[in-house]
Each structure stands twice: as structure tokens, then as C-alpha cells.
């Protein structure tokens, strides 16, 4: 028998690589049974993940999985940084992993950069 | 069920390109990590790297980074790795494999491998 | 990178004995999300490596429960409590926590 328990399906240490000035949508997906969840996203500052309040969200419908969606309108490069998205489930919290966003500035790119690149420049995220 | 299936040229010339593909079946890639990784004759595995084909992000070996290149086909349900500047180092049998999802993240499907020479 | 260290380099034992191979990572492999992805692997000659064990101690499916996986941090373990003809194979250890993935250098078992 298949779980009825919520699950938020962000891939463990995924990235994304983006550029400053464009629309982007950072998806969580988010596997349920019956009720949705109330889902919110946060910004992870450090070890502490601070709530994103204000934003722009949607959800999108699929067959077998729903996504909430966290919309950039667009990409700044304080957007730079890693983001959780999260459940509330029977009173309980659940978690996903966190995904990175690495902004380029496009003002400050030259030419733009390979998506290992960016991911093998993590203090990136610090700047 | 899950298949993953490496294929390519078993002969390589040396200072040439290295070419596989690895055709998957029973899953979609865009679900998941497809990784490389080689073992020279009577030798240890050597992870080569892997991408994430949802978006093309790639993480490579420090070791072999200057040299190889993981792309994806999402509407093949396939992956590619070249690599670049070969030497009779790099003969090897290549894998693909799966990194499953939540909750494990962990390599749980292998393709056969394919043995790849280089040699003149 | 972290280096993942595998002992023995081989082992030789009779049937029904039990055989112990140790991983030692060069740092810990506890990830920020609580788990630890270690992983044990077992290979077979002219065979791709099958997973046997995954986070640290979870037996995949079909895999005997004479395996066992323990440990923390950076030590880690697996057991096989009665060694059968069928477990000749390399075993390595393998981390999935910090990039770039490494193996261990792979421990040989063998029958006496």
C-alpha cells in the first residue's frame, strides 16, 4: 500500500544556474494524498531558513504530482542562495532538501559561465 | 523495469575523444542523477561524474574535470559523457548508473558496463 | 576529496566464518540533512557493482541478512556473519555525502 504521507520531492544537492533580469520558477514538488498541504518556501541563512513572505506563488497540477511554485519576476542577484521548501502536514513540519541558485549578474558576466562552473564556485552563494 | 544500457566505441585512439551514451528504460531521467563511472583493468571504481538531466547541471572528479563532458537528452532518455585527450590510462570499463531519489540517493541501478581501449 | 580507506585489502575465510571489512573516511560523512550516505557495494567479476547496503545500515531488497552495515561519522563496517561460497566477490564502500563521490579502494573475499 503506497504512503499517504506528504513528500516533497527537491532533489538532494540540486542546482540551478540562472541569470540576473530573467524570469525563473523554482518548483517544489510535492506529493500528497488527499488534503494539499499548506506549503511555504525559505531562504536558508546560514543554518536558519527564513521564511519568504510576500511572494509570489502558484501551484501547478500533474497527473501523479502537484508543484508550488516560487516565481522570480525577476532574478535578482540577492536571489543568489540555496532554498527550502516546506510542509505542514497533521501538525507536523516536513522538510525538503535544499536547492541552490547560482545568479549570474549579467552587468558584471562577461560571457556565461558552464553550469560546472558554477557549481564548483559554492562561495558564490556567500557573496 | 530499470535498464540502463552503455554503448559506444570500444576502440579509442589515443590523444582522441572517448564517446558513450547510456540508454535508459524503465524510469525517466529527468527524475533522477545519471552518473559515470570507470574501473581500468584489475582495478578499483574511479566516479567520473553525473548530471542532472532535469536541468543539465553536471558535477565532475577534480581529477578529470579539464577532460570530460556529461550531457543528457531528456527526450531520448539518454546520457553522454566524452572524454577528451585520451591515454592508455583511460582504458577502462565504463558504467552509467542511477542515483535513485528520495529518500536514499544512493547509485541502486547499473548498466552492464562497456570496455573501452585505447590503443593505436 | 574525501578518501575513503577500506581493511583488509583481502580477506581469506572458510565457510560459515564471519568476515568484518572496515571504511574510514578522511572526514565525516554526516550530511546536513541528518543522513549519512554511505553506501556498501558488492561486485562479481565480469559484473557491474549491486548495491548491498544504503544509508550506512539498510539492507537493500533481495540482499541476505547475514549483511549488515554499521557505524557514524567516519567509521564504518560491514559484516557478514556466515560467509557462504556466493559472497566471493570486491567489496567496496562508497560516499555519496560530499562531492566528488569516492570509493573505497575495494576489499577482495575470498573462500579458504
Known amino acids: 500500500k503506497e504512503s499517504c504521507d506528504v513528500q516533497l520531492y527537491i532533489k538532494r544537492q540540486s542546482y540551478h544556474s540562472i541569470f540576473a533580469g530573467d524570469p525563473f520558477k523554482l518548483e517544489c514538488p510535492v506529493k500528497y494524498c488527499a488534503h494539499r498541504p499548506q506549503v511555504t518556501w525559505c531562504k536558508l541563512n546560514g543554518t536558519t531558513c527564513v521564511k519568504l513572505e510576500g511572494r509570489h506563488t502558484s501551484w501547478k497540477q500533474e497527473k501523479n504530482l502537484s508543484f508550488f511554485i516560487l516565481h522570480f519576476e525577476p532574478v535578482l542577484p540577492s536571489d543568489n542562495g540555496s532554498y527550502r521548501c516546506s510542509a505542514n502536514f497533521l501538525s507536523a513540519i516536513i522538510e525538503s532538501h535544499s536547492t541552490t541558485l547560482y545568479v549570474t549578474d549579467v552587468k558584471s558576466a562577461s560571457e556565461r559561465p558552464s553550469k560546472d562552473e558554477m557549481a564548483s564556485r559554492p562561495w558564490l552563494l556567500y557573496s | 523495469q530499470v535498464q540502463l544500457q552503455e554503448s559506444g566505441p570500444g576502440l579509442v585512439k589515443p590523444s582522441g575523444t572517448l564517446s558513450l551514451t547510456c540508454a535508459d528504460s524503465?524510469?525517466?531521467?529527468?527524475?533522477?542523477?545519471i552518473h559515470w563511472v570507470r574501473q581500468p583493468p584489475g582495478k578499483g571504481l574511479e566516479w567520473i561524474g553525473r548530471i542532472d538531466p532535469a536541468n543539465g547541471f553536471t558535477r565532475y572528479n577534480p581529477s578529470l574535470k579539464s577532460r570530460v563532458t556529461i550531457s543528457s537528452d531528456k527526450s531520448k532518455n539518454q546520457a553522454s559523457l566524452k572524454l577528451s585527450s585520451v591515454t592508455a590510462a583511460d582504458t577502462a570499463v565504463y558504467y552509467c548508473a542511477r542515483e535513485d531519489g528520495y529518500p536514499y540517493y544512493t547509485l541502486d541501478a547499473w548498466g552492464q558496463g562497456t570496455t573501452v581501449t585505447v590503443s593505436s | 576529496d574525501i578518501v575513503m580507506t577500506q581493511s583488509p585489502d583481502s580477506l581469506a575465510l572458510s565457510l560459515g566464518e564471519r568476515a568484518t571489512i572496515n571504511c574510514k573516511s578522511s572526514q565525516s560523512l554526516l550530511d546536513v540533512d541528518g543522513k549519512t550516505y554511505l553506501n556498501w557495494f558488492q561486485q562479481k567479476p565480469g559484473q557491474p557493482p549491486k548495491r548491498l547496503i544504503y544509508?550506512?545500515?539498510k539492507l537493500d531488497s533481495g540482499v541476505p541478512d547475514r549483511f549488515s552495515g554499521s557505524g557514524s561519522g567516519t567509521d564504518f563496517t560491514l559484516t557478514i556473519s556466515s560467509v557462504q561460497a556466493e559472497d566471493v566477490a570486491v567489496y567496496y564502500c562508497w560516499q555519496g555525502t560530499h562531492f566528488p563521490r569516492t570509493f573505497g579502494q575495494g576489499t577482495k573475499l575470498e573462500i579458504k
Open positions: 524503465g524510469f525517466s531521467i529527468s527524475d533522477t542523477y
Open positions: 544509508l550506512v545500515s
